[in-house]
């Protein structure tokens, strides 16, 4: 039975330009994490396999980093960026568990509007 | 002025597909993403999903994933969303509203009122 | 899916009466930078609704200054300082920090 919960940074709302950090943590099981992959929509961005370490995807080098931890850095947001990010844990026995973060990437004008936040 | 105009209410039969659409002015429509609300009964608010005009991506309620499909035409900057295979379930009081995380859902449609019945 | 639970469902009220309602998330609803995705909305009958509060207190342009709302986490609230006719109607709060995003059930700002 799958137990585990995944817990996510939550939605991200960040202005162009910017950089931001997306995590996941999965917790309440036992189950080992064999690799997280990291995907937007249909895209796969990045792979953190445990005895692999790290991929990139090539589309993706010049912007995505590794880390912190089995997190993922995004750089040089553009508003293209927008759109729902999932992190897919494979865990051993217990199977798949997935994740969902929205990133919204905003016009410098727009986010203007947002002033009193704290926008990454 | 920013101002979100929907189609008209719409009479379905049981088992057709629809569409709704929600025509954008007064603002760049790529800037902000277009959300879809439910209102059921007269009371119950339910998120269905959002588009960013900007790139076309998506985020569903998973509750509607396979009812709901969303889409824009930038060159018309109107959103649009299609309901699949309705049922008697599925009327309600649709809007359309813009927004971000940020400000919450600061401009409404006017709402379209589906009625499924045979 | 995040649980929103709205208190209270149904609020008699009379004018001049100063009221709050209460919205409580079943996880924090700050995300990793501290920013919390929380707005208030006013639903009228025969109209869309309308926007109150963003952003737990911000006050969205052209709304009134009885109406205001703190909290953090997962708890918060919404204040209406003396209630005025136009204020009657279904209140709602929002939670936009976590996918999918979720509405409270509502509650009814009705006359005693």
């Known amino acids: 039975m799958m137990t585990g919960t995944i817990e996510t940074t939550g939605n991200i709302s960040a202005e162009k330009g910017g950089s931001i950090i997306l995590q996941c943590h999965l917790s309440s099981t036992t189950a080992q994490v064999t690799q997280v992959n990291w995907e937007q929509q249909d895209q796969l961005l990045a792979i953190c396999n445990a005895d692999l370490g790290w991929h990139i995807s090539p589309s993706f080098k010049d912007r995505v980093a590794p880390g912190p931890g089995l997190g993922l850095t995004l750089q040089s947001l553009t508003v293209n960026d927008t759109g729902e990010y999932f992190c897919i844990y494979h865990t051993y026995p217990d199977g798949t568990y997935t994740g969902r973060i929205f990133l919204e990437v905003l016009e410098s004008s727009v986010a203007e509007h947002g002033a009193r936040f704290q926008i990454p | 002025e920013v101002q979100l105009q929907q189609s008209g209410p719409e009479l379905v039969k049981p088992g057709a597909s629809m569409k709704i659409s929600c025509k954008a002015s007064?603002?760049?429509?790529?800037?902000?993403?277009m959300n879809w609300v439910k209102q059921s009964h007269g009371k119950n608010l339910e998120w269905i999903g959002l588009?960013?005009?900007?790139?076309?991506?998506?985020s569903y309620n998973q509750k509607f994933k396979g009812k709901a499909t969303l889409t824009v035409d930038k060159s018309s900057n109107t959103a649009y969303m299609d309901l699949l295979s309705l049922t008697s379930e599925d009327s309600a009081v649709y809007y359309c509203?813009?927004?971000?995380?940020?400000?919450?859902?600061?401009?409404w449609g006017q709402g379209t009122l589906v009625t499924v019945s045979a | 899916d995040v649980v929103v639970t709205q208190t209270p469902l149904s609020l008699p009220v009379s004018f001049g009466d100063q009221v709050s309602i209460s919205c409580r998330s079943s996880?924090?609803?700050?995300?990793?930078?501290?920013?919390?995705?929380l707005s208030w909305y006013l639903h009228k009958p025969g109209q869309s609704p309308q926007l109150l509060i963003y952003?737990?207190?911000n006050r969205f342009s052209g709304v009134p200054d009885r109406f205001s709302g703190s909290g953090s986490g997962t708890d918060f609230t919404l204040k209406i300082s003396t209630i005025k006719p136009e204020d009657l109607g279904l209140y709602y709060c929002?939670?936009?920090?976590?996918?999918?995003?979720?509405f409270g059930a509502g509650t009814k700002l009705e006359l005693k």
């Open positions: 007064g603002f760049s429509f790529p800037g902000y993403t």
């Open positions: 929002l939670q936009g920090t976590h996918l999918p995003l979720t």
């Open positions: 996880q924090s609803l700050a995300n990793s930078y501290g920013n919390t995705y």
């Open positions: 509203t813009r927004g971000t995380l940020i400000t919450g859902f600061a401009y």
């Open positions: 952003g737990i207190s």
């Open positions: 588009i960013n005009p900007y790139n076309g991506a998506t």
